[in-house]
């Protein structure tokens, strides 16, 4: 029950959890399709433990294999707003380093402006992923509404 | 304190051009989309244009698209509406709009506008 | 295009008076992104109410806002004598964003 109460007492890190769930701060410049995240128990239902934030983009600092997801919802836009202004698509990837750069998940908007999506995939310590929203349509920043995480599922 | 201040509205002949500007102040302007709104005299309000916070996006009313050019200059807090060829149907007062944070395109303050003439 | 119309076009109250003003959609506007507006001869249009049914910022509670769908309802549950105005609904959860032509709320 002591090893029970110590273990309670250890942050999530120590055990190998490393969990970040995020909310949308805000979009790139001109030419720049990233989107730009935050995170922190001061912005509600948002956190980091373990990986962190490196100028709005999420870096992992544990290797294993994680779940990443993902909701956008976008702010301006309709079923046929979506298509006129085709394509609107989300793009999540490891962006750094270069050496290990790969698309992980790419969905099309198409006939919708919400879209979700979540995978498991194995990163490495120092992997920075990149969440790209291609298209001229806005994403909503309400926080039920747009959202980025990870967490870590086994080494 | 929130303020939006237009001007560069006149009167101006059919084929004519004319610029807005908008000056925004009390709030971090890059950070908002931005739109103009326009009232013909007695009329009903309607949308114009619309400029994402970056400006990387623009969205126009198919009554002015391929006439009008919305854009904005962070640096100086100012919305901008390029109007070319005009036409007498464009005679309104013309409101600058700030979108609330989250993009949706409700307005939550607006200027108190600049009256645009389109008049031979 | 989604076309709002409202009604009625004018309604004539005293004050006290419960005012209840009507906007239609000509198709359904996503996720009741609605808004309503008021203003005032002379002014730039004031928002009351944004989501179909949330207040915002400094506006007293006898204004709320209910429906979804293609049907919407601004109500004012005692009018004051600064509420007698133009208010205008608007979509925006479809580009073109459009707005009603406005119900006028006078004087009896």
């Known amino acids: 029950q002591r090893f029970a109460q110590a273990q309670q007492q250890l942050p999530l890190e120590s055990l190998g959890w490393d969990v970040a769930e995020l909310q949308l701060n805000h979009t790139g410049p001109q030419q720049d399709p990233r989107l730009y995240w935050q995170g922190g128990p001061a912005l509600g239902r948002s956190f980091l433990h373990g990986p962190e934030l490196d100028k709005g983009q999420l870096r992992i600092h544990r290797d294993g294999i994680y779940m990443v997801h993902i909701q956008v919802t976008l702010a301006i836009c309709s079923s046929t707003t979506a298509s006129r202004h085709h394509p609107t698509t989300l793009a999540v990837g490891i962006c750094s380093p270069a050496s290990r750069s790969i698309s992980l998940l790419r969905l099309s908007f198409h006939q919708g402006c919400t879209i979700a999506s979540q995978r498991l995939t194995p990163l490495a310590r120092g992997d920075t992923l990149c969440t790209n929203l291609t298209g001229t349509l806005l994403p909503s920043r309400n926080t039920d509404e747009t959202f980025f995480g990870v967490q870590w599922v086994r080494p | 304190e929130v303020q939006l201040l237009e001007s560069g509205g006149g009167l101006v002949q059919p084929g004519g051009s004319l610029r807005l500007s908008c000056a925004a102040s009390?709030?971090?302007?890059?950070?908002?989309?931005m739109s103009w709104v326009r009232q013909a005299p007695g009329k009903c309000l309607e949308w114009v244009s619309t400029?994402?916070?970056?400006?990387?996006?623009?969205f126009y009313a198919e009554s002015v698209k391929g006439r009008f050019t919305i854009s904005r200059d962070n640096s100086k807090n100012t919305l901008y509406l390029q109007m070319n060829r005009l036409r007498a149907e464009d005679t309104a007062v013309y409101y600058c709009?700030?979108?609330?944070?989250?993009?949706?395109?409700?307005?939550?303050?607006w200027g108190q506008g600049t009256l645009v003439t389109v008049s031979s | 295009e989604i076309v709002l119309t409202q009604s009625p076009g004018t309604l004539s109250l005293s004050p006290g008076e419960r005012a209840t003003l009507s906007c239609r959609a000509s198709?359904?506007?996503?996720?009741?992104?609605l808004a309503w507006y008021q203003q005032k001869p002379g002014q730039a249009p004031r928002l009351l109410i944004y989501?179909?049914?949330s207040r915002a910022t400094g506006i007293p509670d006898r204004f709320s806002g209910s429906g979804s769908g293609t049907d919407f309802t601004l109500t004012i549950s005692r009018l004051e004598p600064e509420d007698f105005a133009v208010y205008y609904c608007?979509?925006?959860?479809?580009?073109?964003?459009?707005f009603g032509c406005g119900t006028k709320v006078e004087i009896k």
């Open positions: 709009a700030r979108h609330d944070y989250s993009n949706y395109a409700y307005f939550d303050y």
């Open positions: 989501g179909a049914s």
């Open positions: 198709q359904s506007v996503r996720s009741s992104y």
């Open positions: 608007q979509q925006y959860g479809d580009l073109p964003f459009t």
């Open positions: 400029i994402s916070g970056s400006g990387g996006s623009t």
């Open positions: 009390g709030f971090t302007f890059s950070v908002y989309a």
